[in-house]
Every structure is written in structure tokens, then in C-alpha cells.
């Protein structure tokens, strides 16, 4: 009897371990999205970036959805969100319209239930990119910890999108779930 | 009989709890490495920084290895990687040859199995550090979420290494495991 | 007998799952604190920022305490700490005292047991904010992984606090626990 119970217990505990491990993984959605350089919009004002890779190079996604240029939360939780945005200009690209630039990123959250958009994080700098230098570069990094609900969407807006560095190591954003909501 | 089973179960569950707790800890490698100022290389182009502290001040490492200037992954997983790099110049530091500087960081991943190096993240800025000011400073921060395999190596490259701020709160990089690979 | 044991085991395992889930949540303190713009100090030198929101907008806190302008650790562990600090100036705000600015952030840890303060992370830039431009902006982001003990306090110091951007998406800091101390 006792031996049978022990064996049964071990079996149940084994499956419990699998279940715990599996549920732990499922409890941790993430995404790392890299810029799709073939589809960067023009303009100097605030523009939403809608083209990102989620399945090539460093791009990846799990238990989240990428749709219509937005990263969609599938699971309630507290997430660490981050973005790295690089801007560059070389004199061979032609003259800049202005030497005084506002290079900015805005990480926004949109709720479909209550159609509204809120900026979670912003960063950037005003820059003077003078003609005395043949090359200019600038990067912004932002990150923060936010409560996200299933269905909410994260998107990235930037100024001067035509100056974006199209490399996957330069312009990207992401999220990973850290913990459940109590 | 029933009492005996209860006692035995508590005992087994107790050890399961220990095991779960222990395995959770072991599943979370991390490192925070701070610059070793006594061994900063010279050069103006991209230079690999190989001297970091992992066991003094804020420097620490667990379930990862630091060897030959590289942070070695011992355990497959998804990791959050970050770097903070500070550059500075004071008029007493030396004869700065140019006002136009490219201050950059590159976080690279090297696979030994397939000898190749890839940049995961980059950041920085071109700067104009004029002689009209006696002190100049600039910091870069990058961070992102990456899949790393056991044996892969993370290293840091910078431009203008002689301008690095040698403080442990200024120039550092690190990683921590967030979750397993499915 | 065997059926009764199975039922009992399921019940015990169920509560174990609740306990595990609950203890996991309790093992993950976090905070995201946003600047309280009604109480920003003046000055151009290093100033401690003591007014932050922890319960409105993006501000939130759990299993940590905010008191006297400091974020207090209630639970030993390894934490990821971050800060995003934005500075801005518009010509309508009046003339700057100087065009040469040092815009800096320092994330400090204070131990009450051993009354001492140490800088964990710093970042920033010297800037030339010339009168040729009507608007200036600059953001700093820092982040890193640190061992924190219960009772230790995290605070934020900045230079030129009067130039801080008072938006909750602009100037904030935070922490979340990643793992226990072995």
C-alpha cells in the first residue's frame, strides 16, 4: 500500500513539475521587435512606426501578438518595456532641411476598450547637426515597468523617421513579463 | 495509515519546495561587470574592452563566467542585456586632438561553435566637444532582450576608449536571465 | 483508501499551487515612481529629488515603501533598477543663466545600518544650449542589476532640477526584483 502511494505520488509530482514549469514559461510573454527598414515613413513630425520584424534576426515574439504596427498584450501582467532608437545622417545622403533637429521617441499604450492613447515613456534630444561634420549619429534608450492588460497595444512614435538607422542592433523595442497582477 | 501518508507527503512536499526554490535560483544566472580602469586600451576606432571587475564593488556574477574579456553564457535562456558607458574629458586630461567625436558602444555576441560575431545592440552619439568648455561628459545606455545559448560570449566594444569614465557607477554592463527557452 | 488519498492529495496540491503562486508574487517587489512636478527644487548643482508619485498615473509600488523621498527596500534580493530623466528649456521660460550645462542623474543607495551613500549608476551629458534655438531637450536613461538588502534606500539626484520635464512619461525611476539572494 505504502509503496503504491509513494509511486503514485512521484508520478503526480512529476506531472506537477512539468505543469509548473510549463505554466511558468507561459506566464512569461516577451517580444523584441527590430525596425523594418524597407518601410520607414518620411516626415519630420511625430510619426508612428508600424513596420517591425518579429521573426528574423534578433526579432522574436512569444505569447504576445504583433499586428498593424502594434505589439498586442495577450496576458495581463507587469512588463518591462524598452526601446532603443538610433538616428544618423551622412553628408552623402544630401543636405538636411535644418541643422536644428528634435530627435524623439514616444512609447505609447492604446486601450481598445476605452479608445485612448497614452505615452508611457519618452526620450530624446534636440541636436545641432552642423555641416562642418560629415557624419552625425544619436541614440535614445528608454525603459520602464508597466501594468499591461490583455488587449492593450504598445506602439512607437518618433520624430524625423527618415533619419532612423535601419540596423536591427540600432532601432528596436521590446517587452517581457516580469510578474502577474495580484 | 492516513496520518502516516500526510506526514510523508509534507516531508516530500517540503523537499520539493526546497528543490523548486533552488532550481529557480539556479535558473537565473546574472552578471554586472564594472570597468577595470587600470587597463583601458588606447585607440580611436572600435576597440574591445577586455578588463572588467566581477567580484568587487558593484561587480558580481552568478552562473555565468567571465573569461578573456568576455561574459560567457553557461545556461540557455532569454536574457536581458544592458550596458552603460560614460565618456568624459577635462582640460587637464590631455591634449584632445579633435572636437568632433564619435562616442559609441557595441554589445556583441560571439558563438564559438560557428566562429562569428554579431552586434546585438549599439548606441552613442557624435559630439562636438569644444575647447570653450573645460569639462565634457556623455553617457550611453542600451538594453534589450535576447536568446542566448550556452557557450555564447558577450563582449563590449567602444570607440575612443581613452575617454571612458573609469568609475564603477559610470561604465558597466550586465545580463540577467528572465526565462528558459521553450 | 486509495481514492481518499488521491482526493486529499489533490486538495493539498491545490493549496500548494496557491501558496507557490502567492509566494512568487510576494517575492517580486516593484516600484515605478514618477516625478511630482509641484515640488521640484531649484539650483544647478547636485540636488536630491524627494517628491515622486507612487499611486497615480503610471506610478505604482508593491512590497517596497516610499518615504521621505526615498524608495525603501523591504525584501532582500537582486533588483533591476532604472531611471529616465528628461530636461528641457523653452525660450519662453526665460533666459538660461549659462549656455553650458551639465545635465546629470545619479542613482544612489543609502544604508541606514552603516550611514553611507553610494552611487550605483550615473549618466548624463554636458550640453551647449545656445540662444539660437527656441527649444532644447535632453533625456538620460540608466539601468543596472544590483543586490539590495531590506532597509536600504534608493534615491535620485540630478543637476539643474529646474530644467526637469515634469511629465510622468519623461522623468521617473523604478525597480523590480528579479531573484532572491542565494
Amino acid at each position: 500500500g505504502s509503496q503504491h502511494i509513494r509511486a503514485e505520488k512521484a508520478m503526480v509530482d512529476g506531472s506537477w513539475l512539468d505543469l509548473a514549469k510549463r505554466s511558468k514559461l507561459e506566464a512569461q510573454p516577451f517580444a523584441h521587435l527590430t525596425i523594418n527598414a524597407t518601410d520607414i515613413p518620411s516626415g519630420s513630425h511625430k510619426v508612428s512606426l508600424s513596420s517591425w520584424y518579429h521573426d528574423r534576426g534578433w526579432g522574436k515574439i512569444s505569447n504576445m501578438t504583433f499586428s498593424n504596427g502594434k505589439l498586442i498584450v495577450n496576458q495581463d501582467g507587469f512588463y518591462y518595456l524598452y526601446a532603443n532608437i538610433c538616428f544618423r545622417h551622412h553628408e552623402t545622403s544630401g543636405d538636411l532641411a535644418t541643422e536644428y533637429l528634435q530627435l524623439m521617441v514616444y512609447v505609447t499604450k492604446t486601450s481598445i476598450k476605452i479608445p485612448s492613447s497614452h505615452t508611457l515613456m519618452k526620450g530624446g534630444s534636440t541636436k545641432y547637426w552642423s555641416g562642418n561634420s560629415e557624419f552625425h549619429f544619436y541614440s535614445i534608450n528608454v525603459g520602464g515597468f508597466f501594468k499591461l492588460r490583455s488587449g492593450e497595444e504598445i506602439s512607437i512614435e518618433v520624430s524625423n523617421p527618415s533619419l532612423l538607422d535601419p540596423d536591427q542592433d540600432a532601432t528596436y523595442f521590446g517587452a517581457f513579463k516580469v510578474r502577474d497582477i495580484d | 495509515g492516513s496520518q502516516h501518508i500526510r506526514a510523508e507527503k509534507a516531508m516530500v512536499d517540503g523537499s520539493w519546495l526546497d528543490l523548486a526554490k533552488r532550481s529557480k535560483l539556479e535558473a537565473q544566472p546574472f552578471a554586472h561587470l564594472t570597468i577595470n580602469a587600470t587597463d583601458i586600451p588606447s585607440g580611436s576606432h572600435k576597440v574591445s574592452l577586455s578588463s572588467w571587475y566581477h567580484d568587487r564593488g558593484w561587480g558580481k556574477i552568478s552562473n555565468m563566467t567571465f573569461s578573456n574579456g568576455k561574459l560567457i553564457v553557461n545556461q540557455d535562456g532569454f536574457y536581458y542585456l544592458y550596458a552603460n558607458i560614460c565618456f568624459r574629458h577635462h582640460e587637464t586630461s590631455g591634449d584632445l586632438a579633435t572636437e568632433y567625436l564619435q562616442l559609441m558602444v557595441y554589445v556583441t555576441k560571439t558563438s564559438i561553435k560557428i566562429p562569428s560575431s554579431h552586434t546585438l545592440m549599439k548606441g552613442g552619439s557624435t559630439k562636438y566637444w569644444s575647447g570653450n568648455s573645460e569639462f565634457h561628459f556623455y553617457s550611453i545606455n542600451v538594453g534589450g532582450f535576447f536568446k542566448l545559448r550556452s557557450g555564447e560570449e558577450i563582449s563590449i566594444e567602444v570607440s575612443n576608449p581613452s575617454l571612458l569614465d573609469p568609475d564603477q557607477d559610470a561604465t558597466y554592463f550586465g545580463a540577467f536571465k528572465v526565462r528558459d527557452i521553450d | 483508501g486509495s481514492q481518499h488519498i488521491r482526493a486529499e492529495k489533490a486538495m493539498v496540491d491545490g493549496s500548494w499551487l496557491d501558496l507557490a503562486k502567492r509566494s512568487k508574487l510576494e517575492a517580486q517587489p516593484f516600484a515605478h515612481l514618477t516625478i511630482n512636478a509641484t515640488d521640484i527644487p531649484s539650483g544647478s548643482h547636485k540636488v536630491s529629488l524627494s517628491s515622486w508619485y507612487h499611486d497615480r498615473g503610471w506610478g505604482k509600488i508593491s512590497n517596497m515603501t516610499f518615504s521621505n523621498g526615498k524608495l525603501i527596500v523591504n525584501q532582500d534580493g537582486f533588483y533591476y533598477l532604472y531611471a529616465n530623466i528628461c530636461f528641457r528649456h523653452h525660450e519662453t521660460s526665460g533666459d538660461l543663466a549659462t549656455e553650458y550645462l551639465q545635465l546629470m542623474v545619479y542613482v544612489t543607495k543609502t544604508s541606514i545600518k552603516i550611514p553611507s551613500s553610494h552611487t550605483l549608476m550615473k549618466g548624463g551629458s554636458t550640453k551647449y544650449w545656445s540662444g539660437n534655438s527656441e527649444f532644447h531637450f535632453y533625456s538620460i536613461n540608466v539601468g543596472g542589476f544590483f543586490k539590495l538588502r531590506s532597509g536600504e534606500e534608493i534615491s535620485i539626484e540630478v543637476s539643474n532640477p529646474s530644467l526637469l520635464d515634469p511629465d510622468q512619461d519623461a522623468t521617473y525611476f523604478g525597480a523590480f526584483k528579479v531573484r532572491d539572494i542565494d
Partner: antibody, heavy 122, light 107 residues
Amino acid sequence: EVQLVESGGGLVKPGGSLRLSCAASGFTFRNYAMSWVRQAPGKGLEWVSGISSGGTYTYYPDTVKGRFTISRDNAKNSLYLQMNSLRAEDTAVYYCARRDYGDVYEWYFDVWGKGTTVTVSS
Amino acid sequence: DIQMTQSPSSLSASVGDRVTITCKASQDVRTSIAWYQQKPGKAPKLLIYSASYRYTGVPSRFSGSGSGTDFTFTISSLQPEDIATYYCQQHYSSPWTFGGGTKVEIK
């Protein structure tokens, strides 16, 4: 062809002044720090001044500090050395030299002019 | 200021000989040493920088080594066109200082 051509040398009395010029061609002058290096007759080389690529940093050894002033005009691809309160020991061939790219704090010289002779004598 | 002491001040060698010149710095300069060649009546030419890196177009018979305070410049096989005075320079800290020179002649 990368070239540096010095001019302005000559004979001057002690206490007098002289302005040397160096015309640069064949490279993007504004990208390089520049220096003046002199060589007294039958002696070795002595660095006498340096200027950053943008012209906002100037450097001198103690032997000439306060007497010599280095400057540049990037629009004209030109480097200058204004020498005041000249002494007999300033007699030398003065070379204009381009600092090679390298560590921002380290100066060595990859392109040199042919030199111009300065003689300080009463 | 960092003093650079070069030796010998002059030497005579045959074509094909291995020629070695040494330079000693008065303090540690890591590997921040350059070597120049100056022919009579001409401007100096950069041969080596950062102790051991040959400048573009410099023949492979010229090499440099050393770190800290002791440095060596070598011509592996002396050629007639190598007749010149050779100078070391520290590029570690300002003011930039040169050695006294080594005059190389053919026997």
C-alpha cells in the same frame, strides 16, 4: 597628393615677431589636428605647438607658452604660427606636421612639410 | 615632461646587416612610441607608431617593439637608402618629446 607647404620664415631680431603659414592640400584639412615642430641647426626635433581639428584647443610646451600662438582657418586650409618675443634659441627650421588619426589624446605625425627657416639674430 | 634617451647616437653598419636602435622613456609610456626617419635636408617620415605598427607604405624590414619604458627599433637588413637619422617620439602625454636621434651610416 597630400601636401603641406610652409612659408613666412626669415631673419628677425631678438624680441621681434614673425608669422608662419602652412598651406594644406590633398586631404580634408578640417578633420585633422595639426602641429608645428622645429629643428635647431644640427639638433634634434622639438614639438612647439598643436591645435585641434576644429581650432578650439591649442597646446604648447613651456618653452614657448605665452610667446607663440597657433591658429587655423579651415575654410582656407591653412595653419598659422604667430611668434612673438623671439629669442636666439628659437632659431630653427619650422615644420608644419599633420597629426595622424589615432587615440584622441596621442599625437604623432604622418605628414610633414619641407620646413621654413627662422633665424633670430641681432 | 617625459625625457626620451636614444642610443647609440650614431652607428655604422654594412648593407644587409641587422641594425637595432633603443629608446628609453623616463616614465611608463605603455606602447605610445613612434619612430621617424630623416634624411639630410629633408623632413622626417613616420615609420612606426604605437611601438610596433608600421605606417602605410613602410617596408617590412622596419619594425618596432617594446612597452613601458624600453623600446627597440630594428632594420632587419640594412639597405643603402636607409642612411638617415632615426628619431623616437613618445605620444603618451603632452608635451610630445623626441629622442636625440641616431645617425645610421654605411661602413
